[in-house]
């Protein structure tokens, strides 16, 4: 019996990320006796809920229960039955629900009420559903990637756990792109901030962090596209919009009522002499880039320096992990390699956008046309946001690491959210015990 491992006391947690375009359920596990250690929590499962984001269920709330069933049943299978009752479940809704709440608190409440009722029917320890703030989304994303990269650990290692991890304790900045918002969070060189709204202070594992964060609502890739369309249709001479952000030969009819449904297009709203218009792709990266830049107001800045729209942004500092849609889009375009320079990315985007739609459809036959059609815009938008919005340069581009997973866990706000709500990130450095008391006898 000398080397026989005792059954470990394992704990589980579930977080649902109710995003603007879809909902994902994440299951995390960790050894119970190590819950205050850094880096011990890891993701065991991601389940993507079939269908759109919960904000789209406002007219069909009776379908929410069925919508969540598959992934919640999957959680039931993955987590041992004996652990069900003590497994916390959290649902955090992000920018899609922030936008719905902006239109109507009643409708947002109704959706969340039905979500809560549905999740309460499962045998887990449901802890509530809420709309998280943009600040929280940014902060928890930053905590997640730095936790997974081992940046909070005081033990210096002679090996690296991930390819781009340096042995220093300098934290990574976090760049998160969703469908309806985008977040930038990092520790600036200068501790003082000109904008208290963008300042966060943390004490984690015995160390103080002064963090800058901002969430740009309406600047997620989907809402940015709606903004661009609403802006461009203002100057269209008829119901045809020749759009450089879509492949040559691509055609799609858009309802004006859909265009003006979101608060994000409010500033471009006007009475148009038609109810529908047709997008006709012309596939020109340079023109698309120019059109996208018009979404960023850089003419006004009440601070020493700004990102765009008058929002304070300190000088960029250190390495950044770019995840969520930053990663999904760049990965699809095969542009996530550390070796690909910003100039090369631009060159590849020019080539990709100019490819005829029929050719693109053939090359990517397995990809849904709705998603496939938008990669030219999304790639262009990402470049514009990072370079002109956040002021990365050709040189600092190499400090951006497009990250999908770290150590098998998805980069995103959900892990940081759970670590915080389960009190698994201590303010002080835990006293290290000489031996783990549960592993071997």
């Amino acid at each position: 019996t000398q080397n026989k491992a005792l059954p470990e006391n394992i704990k589980y947690g579930i977080v649902l990320d109710a995003g603007s375009s879809h909902t994902s359920l994440y299951i995390y596990k960790w050894p119970a006796e190590k819950e205050n250690d850094t880096g011990v929590v890891h993701q065991v499962e991601e389940c993507r809920v079939k269908g759109p984001g919960i904000s789209k269920y406002v007219q069909k709330v009776n379908e929410i229960g069925i919508y969540l069933t598959d992934c919640m049943e999957r959680a039931r299978e993955v987590i041992p039955r004996s652990q069900h009752q003590e497994t916390p479940v959290y649902l955090g809704a992000t920018a899609g629900m922030r936008l719905l709440r902006m239109e109507s608190e009643e409708l947002a409440d109704r959706v969340l009420d039905v979500v809560e009722r549905s999740l309460s029917n499962y045998p887990f320890d449901f802890q509530g559903a809420r709309i998280i703030t943009g600040q929280e989304e940014g902060a928890y994303g930053w905590i997640t990637i730095n936790y997974l990269l081992g940046k909070f650990s005081q033990k210096t290692r002679w090996f690296s756990i991930v390819p781009y991890e340096t042995n220093n304790q300098e934290t990574f900045g976090a760049l998160d792109l969703g469908g309806a918002s985008t977040q930038i969070t990092f520790v600036p060189q200068n501790q003082t901030t000109e904008s208290p709204d963008n300042a966060l202070q943390f004490r984690l594992y015995g160390k103080d962090y002064n963090v800058y964060t901002h969430s740009f609502l309406c600047y997620g890739k989907d809402q940015a596209l709606w903004q661009k369309l609403a802006k461009d249709i203002q100057v269209a001479s008829n119901e045809i919009l020749r759009d450089p952000c879509f492949h040559p030969g691509y055609k799609k009819v858009v309802n004006v009522s859909d265009l003006y449904k979101t608060p994000c297009t409010k500033r471009f709203e006007m009475t148009l002499p038609f109810q529908q218009f047709e997008i006709q792709g012309i596939g020109n990266y340079q023109q698309c880039h120019q059109s996208v830049l018009e979404l960023f107001n850089t003419s006004y800045c009440p601070y020493s320096q700004c990102a765009f729209n008058g929002i304070f942004l300190p000088p960029l500092q250190g390495d950044f992990g770019a995840f969520s849609a930053f990663y999904f889009v760049m990965n699809f375009l095969n542009l996530t390699s550390e070796k690909v320079s910003q100039e090369k990315v631009t060159e590849m985007m020019k080539k990709f956008c100019s490819q005829p739609w029929e050719e693109i459809k053939t090359s990517y036959a397995g990809v849904k046309e709705k998603y496939l059609s938008e990669y030219c815009f999304s790639g262009t938008y990402i470049l514009s946001l990072l370079l002109q919005g956040y002021h990365f340069t050709a040189d600092s581009w190499e400090h951006i690491h497009f990250i999908g997973k770290i150590q098998g866990s998805d980069a995103g706000w959900t892990l940081g959210y759970m670590l915080n709500l389960t009190n698994m990130i201590p303010a002080e450095q835990p006293l290290s015990t000489p031996l783990s008391h549960s592993t071997y006898v």
Partner: antibody, heavy 116, light 111 residues
Framework: QVQLVQSGAEVKKPGASVKVSCKAS????????MHWVRQAPGQRLEWIGY????????TFNQKFKGRATITVDTSARTAYMELSSLRSEDTAVYYC?????????WGQGTLVTVSS | DIVMTQSPDSLAVSLGERATINCRAS??????????MYWYQQKPGQPPKLLIY???NQGSGVPDRFSGSGSGTDFTLTISSLQAEDVAVYYC?????????FGGGTKVEIK
């Protein structure tokens, strides 16, 4: 906690303009719309319009269109309502209120008196 | 525009007694299963205070004696046991459609 603090009382001559401010604190300013409502002496409350602080887009009660302008300064977390071509019947208390469809938080009100 | 008609214009009720105020909309204020109907209390020199939202939900910090009911076009605000501090003007409001409109108000006094 959420607070909306409005500028002080104003006395204006007919034909002039007035600009009332509303400074917000205690929440993410760009996450909620800001509405403006007025109440003339002994009258019912009257909705003027609202602004989306996120991008400056606004919607007005047709009655005030062309005469009312609503703007924001997001860095100062402040919304403004300007009413032009004032007439005596514009004498009222003007309120800002935060909300999408639910006006849960109101400013203390700004009395605007139009008198020759 | 949706016209909101409140009744009565004024109401005198004894302390501890029930007060009932009605509000009728010129068309339904329901949408997506939600009633976009609100009740506010206003005391002299103060801004309105949200009492009820979504026709029947209590605003935060609102005493339990205030309740709302109704759907479609007909709504009621009830004060189950009138207290001295409830003397005020009460307004209904709809936000289903722009322009958002208010009722004419009901003045509640102590008999």
């Amino acid at each position: 906690q959420v607070q909306l603090v409005q500028s002080g009382a104003e006395v204006k001559k007919p034909g002039a303009s007035v600009k009332v401010s509303c400074k917000a604190s205690g929440y993410t300013f760009t996450d909620y719309n800001m509405h403006w409502v007025r109440q003339a002496p002994g009258q019912r409350l009257e909705w003027i319009g609202y602004i989306v602080p996120l991008n400056g887009g606004s919607t007005f009660n047709q009655k005030f269109k062309g005469r009312a302008t609503i703007t924001v300064d997001t860095s100062a977390r402040t919304a403004y309502m300007e009413l032009s071509s004032l007439r005596s019947e514009d004498t009222a208390v003007y309120y800002c209120a935060r909300g999408g469809t639910r006006f849960a938080y109101w400013g203390q009100g700004t009395l605007v008196t139009v008198s020759s | 525009d949706i016209v909101m008609t409140q009744s009565p214009d004024s109401l005198a009720v004894s302390l501890g007694e029930r007060a009932t105020i009605n509000c009728r909309a010129s068309e339904s204020v329901d949408n997506f299963g939600v009633s976009f109907m609100y009740w506010y209390q206003q005391k002299p020199g103060q801004p309105p205070k949200l009492l009820i939202y979504g026709a029947s939900n209590q605003g935060s910090g609102v005493p339990d004696r205030f309740s709302g009911s109704g759907s479609g076009t007909d709504f009621t605000l009830t004060i189950s046991s009138l207290q001295a501090e409830d003397v005020a003007v009460y307004y209904c409001q709809q936000t289903k459609e722009v322009p958002y409109t208010f009722g004419g108000g009901t003045k509640v006094e102590i008999k």
